[in-house]
């Protein structure tokens, strides 16, 4: 039989979030959703000025080990 | 020891409805979101939706395939969950699996059998 | 919803030989920000609910020989089996985590000659 559970975090990470590793949390609706939901922002040219998506602080933590990422909003927003 | 074992299975007709259980132990069920998959006789996988854990208000996700005829929901002990099938087709004979997810579905029960027969 | 194809369908095999199955997702799988990729491989022997081979697609699940590799990213995923035994008769599914619905492939089948 496999070993028990993973741990919910890798020894470097911030507290972890709810989400189990397979999902990461998004800040701007406070819950768990798939990753591939969640937008990472993409290098603009200076001055533009349309919105970027949506983007995800990734804590510190050992491949598979940690807890799901967290979705922030943007600094402009917050 | 981990271990998922599901219950309910049957024989019912087109149109009727099912519930299926999923009992866990051997691990911290809290810690996990719970999902179930089906298998239709030699065919492959298809999953069905999970519902998250306690800290996630027990939230659910499901697949367009059974979104508004089935329900999966937690007892209040949290170390049982179910499978509400309503409306049943005959397309939904299959074996239905629980397993848990964290990481991927990490670990997986026997599966009990559906059949959708008139 | 991301389409998992999974190639070939069968292969017969001797034992010890290596082995290598192919998935390929609609879209990418890889989450830039962790630079993981929301692939899983599971083996489903004859008669026998699913086993987590490897996740991310390439962390082995623990107690899983080391023979099993998982290899790939954005698109294009392997499963490599360095040496095969007759014990790893079964059939091969990889699944996608990373947007809902999850989906799998259509599994490979490993047959030994």
């Known amino acids: 039989m496999r070993r028990g559970p993973r741990s919910l975090r890798g020894r470097d990470a911030p507290a972890p979030t709810p989400c189990v590793p397979a999902e990461c949390f998004d800040l701007l609706v406070r819950h768990c959703v798939a990753c591939g939901l969640l937008r990472t922002p993409r290098p603009k040219p200076a001055g533009a000025s349309s919105p970027a998506p949506r983007t995800a602080l990734q804590p510190q933590e050992s491949v598979g080990a940690g807890a799901g990422e967290a979705a922030l909003p943007l600094p402009g927003l917050l | 020891e981990v271990k998922l074992v599901e219950s309910g299975g049957g024989l019912v007709q087109p149109g009727g409805s099912l519930s299926l259980s999923c009992a866990a132990s051997?691990?911290?069920?809290?810690?996990?979101?719970m999902s179930w998959v089906r298998q239709p006789p030699g065919k492959a996988l298809e999953w069905l939706g999970f519902?998250?854990?306690?800290?996630?208000?027990?939230?659910?996700e499901y697949s367009a395939s059974v979104k508004g005829r089935f329900t999966i929901s937690r007892d209040k002990s949290q170390s049982i969950f179910y499978l509400q099938m309503n409306a049943l087709r005959p397309e939904d004979s299959a074996t239905y699996y629980c397993?848990?997810?964290?990481?991927?579905?990490?670990?997986w029960g026997q599966g009990t059998s559906v059949t959708v027969s008139s | 919803d991301i389409v998992m194809s999974q190639s070939p369908s069968s292969l017969a095999v001797s034992v010890g030989e290596k082995v290598t199955m192919s998935c390929k997702s609609s879209q990418s799988l890889l989450y830039s920000n962790n630079q993981k990729n929301y692939l899983a491989w599971y083996q489903q022997k004859p008669g026998q609910s699913p086993k987590l081979l490897i996740y991310?697609?390439?962390t082995r699940e623990s107690g899983v020989p080391d023979r099993f590799t998982g290899s790939g990213s954005g698109t294009d995923f392997t499963l490599t089996i360095s040496s095969v035994k007759a014990e790893d008769l079964a059939v091969y599914y990889c699944?996608?985590?990373?947007?809902?619905?999850?989906?799998f492939g259509g599994g490979t089948k490993l047959e030994i000659k």
């Open positions: 699944q996608q985590y990373y947007i809902y619905p999850y989906t």
């Open positions: 991310w697609a390439s």
């Open positions: 051997g691990f911290t069920f809290t810690d996990y979101y």
């Open positions: 519902i998250r854990n306690k800290a996630n208000g027990y939230t659910t």
């Open positions: 397993a848990s997810l964290r990481s991927a579905l990490d670990y």
